[in-house]
């Protein structure tokens, strides 16, 4: 059994065959004698009953209203009525792009990670018996594939696979040739699996400072988009009016991860700022990483090995 048309709002391209199938079809077969009616309303017209005499392009079957093909003036609201059952659809018919093999507004966009498996199959169950050939195009160039009936691509994504893939079904009806197009815009991106965030540089940093001067402690990390980076210091963050957290800066890496840096600015350094831990932490669902800064008076530098200093 074909799936019924359950979406209440539908956009289609002019010139293509199209059908609406109501969702109480099994019920309709049980009640063969029940009167079943299709109606259309649009702007000026209220509920006009549809029948094959309404238009040579319209065909009515038990459960289906067919358009051969659908045209711009078919835009409007459609109703199916049977006893106390009513189903309504709003149909929007859009103009075909005559300069391309597909219409941009009818494209389904998908993001596929590189090396991930994807499969495109051109298959049309409703018009199956009428389809005499089906082709798959990439960026409007026909792909030469083995299976002409249901052309299929199965592969692990590579960057060169990016593009517009159009399945075009060619079918005959009443001596006329029609085609139906379905297009996917596939964008290939870097592997988006999460990394374990890491803070850059040594875990413990002694910073030589002078009293009364200012210092900027820079904390940098490689992290995922949803990860956070923050500073912890003193008994209670924010208790020292001379300490300010600057706005976090983020740059996206070519691999789709983020390079973040957050500066802690300490103004008018006093004795209370010396020899205490200023901790920078990066946190993610996968865990945390912390690095520490200790401010040391320049005069005391001789007591500490040179390799632990940062500027």
């Amino acid at each position: 059994a074909e799936s019924c048309t359950s979406r209440p709002h539908i956009t289609v391209v002019e010139g293509e065959p199209f059908y609406l199938k109501h969702c109480s079809c099994s019920l309709a077969h049980e009640i063969e004698t029940t009167t079943k009616s299709w109606y259309k309303s649009s702007g000026s017209q209220e509920h006009v009953e549809l029948n094959p005499r309404s238009s040579s392009r319209i065909a009515l079957h038990d459960c289906v209203l067919e358009f051969w093909p659908v045209e711009l003036n078919d835009t409007g609201s459609y109703f199916f009525q049977m006893k106390n059952y009513t189903q309504k659809w709003k149909l929007n018919v859009i103009r075909r792009n005559k300069h391309s093999c597909f219409t941009e507004r009818q494209v389904t966009s998908k993001i596929v990670e590189v090396k991930k498996f994807f499969q495109i199959t051109c298959e049309n169950s409703y018009y199956q018996t009428l389809v005499n050939s089906t082709s798959l195009y990439k960026n409007c160039k026909k792909l030469l594939l083995e299976n002409n009936k249901n052309p299929t691509i199965k592969k692990n994504a590579e960057f060169e696979d990016q593009g517009y893939y159009s399945c075009v079904h060619f079918l005959h009806h009443n001596g006329k040739l029609f085609n139906i197009t379905k297009t996917f815009n596939i964008t290939i991106v870097e592997d988006r699996s999460n990394i374990v965030p890491v803070l850059l540089g040594p875990k413990l940093n002694h910073v030589a400072v002078e009293l009364g001067k200012n210092v900027r402690l820079n904390c940098s990390a490689l992290l995922n988009e949803e990860d956070v980076i923050y500073w912890m210091f003193g008994e209670e963050n924010g208790s020292d009016p001379n300490i300010h957290e600057e706005k976090e800066m983020r740059i996206m890496t070519p691999e789709g991860k983020w390079h973040a840096s957050k500066v802690l600015r300490i103004e008018n350094i006093g004795e209370s700022n010396l020899n205490v831990l200023y901790n920078c932490t990066v946190a993610s669902t996968g865990g945390t990483d912390t690095k520490s800064f200790i401010l040391v008076r320049k005069a005391d530098m001789a007591d500490i090995p040179g390799h632990v200093f940062t500027r």
Epitope: A1, S3, S26, T108, K110, V112, K116, F117, F118, Q119, I120, T121, C122, E123, N124, S125, Y126, K154, Y165, C167, H169, I180, T181, K182, F184, I186
Partner: nanobody, 129 residues
Framework: QVQLVESGGGLVQAGGSLRLSCAAS????????MGWFRQAPGKEREFVAA????????YYADSVKGRFTISRDNAKNTVYLQMDSLKPEDTAVYYC??????????????????????WGQGTQVTVSS
């Protein structure tokens, strides 16, 4: 609308086997690609295996390749996951999922959770060592 109900979970010893079933209601079952996902305690839900609408293509996570087999019976509206050589790390709640159906062409991204529109409630699988 597709409703999914999983069954067949339980407690099994390492090295043992289980067969999970996922029964679907709805007359369009044969139009949906189906997948199995699992979620271990404290971990994110992860892809296990998937099968396309025709049953012509199957796809597996590396961690289960060669041990698990997915199949479907469109006449019975059921998808199966045969799990052999089970390991303690296979312990999880196993979820069955169905993707959305599109007319005229199907793009199948089996590993992508967001591609699946319909989900079952899950069945617990516990593998003891």
């Amino acid at each position: 609308q597709v409703q999914l109900v999983e069954s067949g979970g339980g407690l099994v010893q390492a090295g043992g086997s289980l067969r999970l079933s996922c029964a679907a209601s709805g007359r369009t079952f044969s139009k949906h690609a189906m997948g199995w996902f699992r979620q271990a305690p404290g971990k994110e839900r992860e892809f296990v295996a998937a099968i396309d609408w025709s049953g012509g293509s199957t796809y597996y996570a590396d961690s289960v390749k060669g041990r698990f087999t997915i199949s479907r019976d469109n006449a019975k509206n059921t998808v199966y996951l045969q799990m052999d050589s089970l390991k303690p790390e296979d312990t999880a709640v196993y979820y069955c999922a169905a993707d959305s159906y599109t007319d005229y062409a199907q793009l199948w991204l089996p590993e992508l959770e967001s591609e699946y529109d319909y989900w079952g409630q899950g069945t617990q699988v516990t593998v003891s060592s």
